[in-house]
Interface confidence: low
C-alpha cells in the first residue's frame, strides 16, 4: 500500500564526509514497527545503503558496522550517513515500511541528491 | 545481489533430526523477517514457520508445530529450521524465503534444500 | 485458514495467446495477494504483490487484478519462457496460504 515519504531534495556532505537529512513518512495510525531502508540510485540500479528496523519501544539501531546512524521521533527518522566520498555524490533515497501491526506500508522518498566533495589535502609545511 | 543459499538437506530415517541452514548476503538480514516454504515432490508450496527480525516472534504451520524451530543468527546472516521427529510426509524441498512484511509475499527465495525422510 | 482455489488446473496455449488464471479465496483477502512462476526444478520467482503491482524486473506483459475474493493473472502475449506454474497465495493473514498451482503448457 502506497505511502507518502518526504525527505529534502538536496545536501551537502561536510568536509569529514558526513551527511545527515529528515526523512518524515504520512502515516494514518502508529505502526509499532517501522523498517527504514538508505538506497542510493545510480543510473537504473538501486543499491541497498543501510537499513533498521525499529520499534515504539526502542531507539532507531543501524548495525555497528553501518555507515549509517540515526534517531526517531514520531513519524521523522534523522538520518546520517558517514564516510562519504567524492565518488559516493548521487541521489540516497529513503524508503520506510510500516511493518506492524498490519496493513503493510511502504513508501519511497523521491530522493535526496548529497553532494560529497573531498577536502583538500593540507600542504606540506617545514 | 541479494541472495538465499540453503544447505543442510539430506536422507534421514523417519523419527531422527536434521538442521537446515540458509545463508543471507546482499541486503541487511538483521532487518527482515524470514520464513521457511516447503514443496513436497510433485506437490504445490507449503509455508512452514516464520520468524521476526529480532527473533521475537515466531509462527508456525499447524502440521510443523511442536517438531520444527526456526531461529536465526543476525550475526551470521544466518536462518536455521530445526527439524526433530521427522515423517515420511516432510519429505520435501525446503525454500527460505524473505517477506517484505510478516506474512508476506516472498520476495526473494533460495534455490531450495531437499529433505527426504525414508527408513 | 484461508483456502485458495486457482483455476484451470492446466491449461494448453501458444505463443502469443492471452492467458488467464483466476484465484478464488475462501474470505476477503482485500488486495493481499502475490502470484509466483515456478518452473521445473527452480525455485519459485515472484511476478506480483499486492494483487496487482509488478515485481522489479517482471515484463510488462503480466499483469495483476482483483481485490476482495476474485483476482486474475494475466499474460498477454505469452512466451516461450512463460511456460511453467503459476501459483497465488494470499497473506492477509496467518497462515500464509498458496494456491494449488496451474500449469500452462505448450500446444
Known amino acids: 500500500k502506497g505511502m507518502h515519504v518526504a525527505q529534502p531534495a538536496v545536501v551537502l556532505a561536510s568536509s569529514r564526509g558526513v551527511a545527515s537529512f529528515v526523512c518524515e513518512y504520512g502515516s494514518s495510525g502508529n505502526a509499532a514497527e517501522v523498517r527504514v531502508t538508505v538506497l542510493r540510485q545510480a543510473g537504473s540500479q538501486m543499491t541497498e545503503v543501510c537499513a533498521a528496523t525499529y520499534t515504539v519501544e526502542d531507539e532507531l539501531a543501524f548495525l555497528d558496522d553501518s555507515t549509517c546512524t540515526g534517531t526517531s521521533s514520531g513519524n521523522k527518522v534523522n538520518l546520517t550517513i558517514q564516510g562519504l566520498r567524492a565518488m559516493d555524490t548521487g541521489l540516497y533515497i529513503c524508503k520506510v515500511e510500516l511493518m506492524y501491526p498490519p496493513p503493510y506500508y511502504v513508501g519511497m522518498g523521491n530522493g535526496t541528491q548529497i553532494y560529497v566533495i573531498d577536502p583538500e589535502p593540507c600542504p606540506d609545511s617545514d | 545481489q541479494v541472495q538465499l543459499v540453503e544447505s543442510g538437506g539430506g536422507v534421514v530415517q523417519p523419527g531422527r533430526s536434521l538442521r537446515l541452514s540458509c545463508a543471507a548476503s546482499?541486503?541487511?538480514?538483521?532487518?527482515?523477517?524470514m520464513h521457511w516454504v516447503r514443496q513436497a515432490p510433485g506437490k504445490g508450496l507449503e509455508w512452514v514457520a516464520v520468524?521476526?527480525?529480532?527473533?521475537?516472534?515466531?509462527y508456525y504451520a499447524d502440521s510443523v508445530k511442536g517438531r520444527f524451530t526456526i531461529s536465526r543468527d543476525n550475526s551470521k546472516n544466518t536462518l536455521y529450521l530445526q527439524m526433530n521427529s521427522l515423517r515420511a510426509e516432510d519429505t520435501a524441498v525446503f525454500y527460505c524465503?524473505?517477506?517484505?512484511?510478516?506474512?508476506?509475499?516472498?520476495?526473494?527465495w533460495g534455490q531450495g534444500t531437499m529433505v527426504t525422510v525414508s527408513s | 485458514d484461508i483456502q485458495m482455489t486457482q483455476s484451470p488446473s492446466s491449461l494448453s496455449a501458444s505463443v502469443g495467446d492471452r492467458v488467464t488464471i483466476t484465484c478464488r479465496a475462501s474470505?476477503?483477502?482485500?488486495?493481499?495477494l502475490a502470484w509466483y512462476q515456478q518452473k521445473p526444478e527452480k525455485a519459485p520467482k515472484s511476478l506480483i504483490y499486492?494483487?496487482?503491482s509488478l515485481q522489479s524486473g517482471v515484463p510488462s506483459r503480466f499483469s495483476g487484478s482483483g481485490s476482495g475474493t476474485d483476482f486474475t493473472l494475466t499474460i498477454s502475449s505469452l512466451q516461450p519462457e512463460d511456460f511453467a506454474t503459476y501459483y497465488c497465495?494470499?497473506?492477509?493473514?496467518?497462515?500464509?496460504?498458496f494456491g494449488q498451482g496451474t500449469k500452462v503448457e505448450i500446444k
Open positions: 520468524i521476526w527480525y529480532d527473533g521475537s516472534n515466531k
Open positions: 497465495q494470499q497473506y492477509n493473514s496467518y497462515p500464509p496460504t
Open positions: 474470505q476477503g483477502i482485500s488486495s493481499w
Open positions: 499486492a494483487a496487482s
Open positions: 524465503a524473505r517477506a517484505p512484511n510478516y506474512i508476506g509475499a516472498f520476495d526473494v
Open positions: 546482499g541486503f541487511t538480514f538483521s532487518s527482515y523477517g
